[in-house]
C-alpha cells in the first residue's frame, strides 16, 4: 500500500497532550525509532509522568482514506463487553503549510489527532518544492510554532548592511518566486530557501533539509544547506550554508527583521528576534482575551460581540461579509453554519459561504500584531477550508462607541483579510515574562 501523504513521510512528527503530560511521536509512513514502542510502532506515546512508552498505533495495521489515517494495534482496551483494540486516528485537512499534527482527545480506545497540511489538499497550489517541519516542543512540552512566519510567496530581506548584495530567506520552505515574482527574487533558483542576490544574478545558498530544532529555551535553530555539489566561485571552495536562530525576546516588543550576525566563506548566520519563537501559549488564546502572568498583556475583545442577531457588515466588491466575533450568535444569512464570518454574493444572495466558524477561533498577539483568526469554514475547490484573518489596530477614538467596524482588505487563496480599528485593541502591557 502506497504512502498516502508522501511529503509527510520524511520526518517523525510530534504532538502533545498537555493535560496529561504525554508526548506522541508519529511516523505516518514507516515506524518511529523508539525501541520501547517496538519495531513497528507508527504512533508511540511517551508518558512523561511515569516515564513509560506505549505503542498506540502499528504501522503494519494502517488503513487510509484521502482524509483519514488509522493505525490499529493488537492491544485490547477495556471498554466493557467489547472487543476493541487501542488505535490512533489522524484526520487530515487542507492547509497552506506542512503544518503540525495536533492532539485532539483520547478515549479509552482511540487517540485522535487533526492535521491541517498541504499534503491533504485536492490541488497542489500550496505545495512547496521543499519544506520541513516548522515547530518544536521544548523540554516542558510547550509548543514553539514558526508556521505563521512561512511565506507562501516572496521572501524576507535580511538586514546585512552590505550595499552590493541582498540575502533573502524564507522560513522552513523554499522561496516561491512564481506566485510573487518580485524583480529581485525572479532570478532565484527553484528550491532555494536562502537566495543571495548580487546585481542581476541570484545564487542558491541554502535549502531546507532538517526541521526546526530547539537549542535551549526560547532559542530555535533552522539550518539550510546547498545540496548539489557545484561550488560557488566566491565561496573559496566551501559549501554555502545558512543558520537562522530565532530568539524569543525577554519581554513584549514589536517585530524585528532578521539580521545577519556573521558571514564567512558563504556561511551565513542570521539572528531573528521574534515572539513567534516563544511558546504558543504566550502568543495565543482560544478565547477573545489574552491576559494573566502567562501572556504579559491584557487584551479583551469580548465587548465587540454583537447581540440580538445583528452583525458587522463589511463590503468586499462582489461580496458582503457579515461578521459576529467573540460570540456564538448565528449570523442569519449563514443560518446553522456556526459562522463567525459569513460571505454572501451580492448578485445572488443564495450563494452563502462560512468564511470561518466561531468555535474555530484563535486570538494571537505576536510581534506587536493583534490578530483574530477564524478557520474551518466552507471548502474551496482546493480543499482548503475558508478562513478569515482580522488584523486589529488600537484606535481610542473609534466610532460606534469605540467598537469601530471591520474593513475587508482582500482575499488570497480562500483566506479573507480584514482590518479593524477599535479601542478594544489597545493593549495593556505587564512586564514579567
Amino acid at each position: 500500500q502506497a504512502a498516502p501523504f508522501p511529503e509527510l513521510c520524511s520526518y517523525t512528527w510530534e504532538a502533545v497532550d498537555t493535560k496529561n503530560n504525554v508526548l506522541y511521536k508519529i511516523n505516518i509512513c514507516g515506524s518511529v525509532d523508539i525501541v520501547q514502542c517496538g519495531p513497528s510502532s507508527a504512533v508511540c506515546m511517551h508518558d512523561l509522568k511515569t516515564r513509560t512508552y506505549h505503542s498506540v498505533g502499528d504501522s503494519v495495521l494502517r488503513s487510509a482514506t484521502r482524509s483519514l489515517l488509522e493505525f490499529n494495534t493488537t492491544v485490547s482496551c477495556d471498554q466493557q463487553g467489547t472487543n476493541h483494540r487501542v488505535q490512533s486516528s489522524i484526520a487530515f485537512l487542507c492547509g497552506k503549510t506542512l503544518g503540525t499534527p495536533e492532539f485532539v482527545t483520547a478515549t479509552e480506545c482511540v487517540h485522535y489527532f487533526e492535521w491541517r497540511t498541504t499534503a491533504a489538499c485536492k490541488k497542489d497550489i500550496f505545495k512547496a518544492n521543499k519544506e520541513v517541519p516548522c515547530y518544536v516542543f521544548d523540554e516542558e512540552l510547550r509548543k514553539h510554532d514558526l508556521n505563521p512566519l512561512i511565506k507562501l510567496s516572496g521572501a524576507y530581506d535580511v538586514d546585512d548592511s552590505d550595499p552590493d548584495t541582498s540575502l533573502f530567506i524564507n522560513v522552513c520552505r523554499d522561496i516561491d518566486t512564481l506566485r510573487d515574482p518580485g524583480s529581485q527574487l525572479r532570478a532565484c533558483p527553484p528550491g532555494t530557501a536562502a537566495c543571495l542576490v548580487r546585481g542581476h544574478q541570484a545564487f542558491d545558498v541554502g535549502q531546507p533539509r532538517d526541521g526546526l530544532k530547539v537549542v535551549r529555551k526560547d532559542r530555535l535553530v533552522l539550518s539550510y544547506v546547498r545540496e548539489e555539489a557545484g561550488k560557488l566561485d566566491f565561496c573559496d571552495g566551501h559549501s554555502p550554508a545558512v543558520t537562522i536562530t530565532f530568539v524569543c525576546p525577554s519581554e513584549r516588543r514589536e517585530g524585528t527583521i532578521p539580521k545577519l550576525t556573521a558571514k564567512s566563506n558563504c556561511r551565513y548566520e542570521i539572528e531573528w528576534i521574534t515572539e513567534y519563537a516563544c511558546h504558543r501559549d504566550y502568543l495565543e488564546s482560544k478565547t477573545c482575551s489574552l491576559s494573566g502572568e502567562q501572556q504579559d498583556v491584557s487584551i479583551d475583545l469580548t465587548p465587540l460581540a454583537q447581540s440580538g442577531g445583528s452583525s458587522y457588515i463589511s463590503d468586499g466588491k462582489e461580496y458582503l461579509f457579515y461578521l459576529n466575533v467573540c460570540g456564538e450568535t448565528e449570523i442569519q444569512f449563514c443560518n446553522k453554519k456556526q459562522a463567525a464570518v459569513c460571505q454572501v454574493k451580492k448578485s445572488d444572495t443564495s450563494q452563502v459561504k462560512a468564511a470561518g466558524r466561531y468555535h474555530n477561533q484563535t486570538l494571537r498577539y505576536s510581534d506587536g500584531d493583534l490578530t483574530l483568526i477564524y478557520f474551518g469554514g466552507d471548502e474551496c475547490s482546493s480543499g482548503f477550508q475558508r478562513m478569515s484573518v482580522i488584523n486589529f489596530e488600537c484606535n481610542k477614538t473609534a466610532g460606534n462607541d469605540g467598537k469601530g467596524t471591520p474593513v475587508f482588505t482582500g482575499e488570497v487563496d480562500c483566506t479573507y483579510f480584514f482590518t479593524w480599528d477599535t479601542e478594544y485593541a489597545c493593549v495593556h502591557h505587564h512586564h514579567h515574562h
Epitope: 493535560k19 503530560n21 504525554v22 478515549t107 487517540h111
Partner: nanobody, 116 residues
C-alpha cells in the same frame, strides 16, 4: 484543602481480589489525570496504572490483564480493581492526581498484603 484518601487495602490470599478506592476532595476531579503507584518494602515506588483525564488507560506490564483502573466522577473517586493477586503484589498502594495547573497530589497510601 486538596486531599486524596486511599482505602480498600487488606490481607488477601494469592489468586484473590481487592478493590482499592481513592477519594478526592478540593479538586475538579474530571480534569485530573489519576495514577496508581505502589511501594514494596525496601524497594522504590513503582507505577502501576494511569487513567488520563480524557479516559485512556495504561498499565505496567506486571499488572496488565489483572488490574483495572476506573473512575466515578460523581463520587470523585478512582478505583483499582486487582484480580489474580500474587505475593509480589504486596506493597503500599498510593494514588496520585495531577493536572497542568496543580502540583502532583499524593494520597497517604493503603497496605495490600498477599499471603497464604
Amino acid at each position: 484543602q486538596v486531599q486524596l484518601q486511599e482505602s480498600g487495602g487488606g490481607l488477601v490470599q494469592p489468586g484473590g481480589s481487592l478493590r482499592l478506592s481513592c477519594a478526592a476532595s478540593g479538586i475538579i476531579f474530571s480534569d485530573n489525570r489519576m495514577d496508581w503507584y505502589r511501594q514494596a518494602p525496601g524497594k522504590q515506588r513503582e507505577w502501576v496504572a494511569t487513567l488520563a483525564s480524557y479516559g485512556w488507560k495504561t498499565y505496567a506490564d506486571s499488572v496488565k490483564g489483572r488490574f483495572t483502573i476506573s473512575r466515578d466522577n460523581t463520587k470523585n473517586t478512582v478505583y483499582l480493581r486487582m484480580n489474580s493477586l500474587k505475593p509480589e503484589d504486596t506493597a503500599v498502594y498510593y494514588c496520585k492526581a495531577s493536572s497542568p495547573v496543580l502540583n502532583d497530589i499524593w494520597g497517604q497510601g493503603t497496605q495490600v498484603t498477599v499471603s497464604s
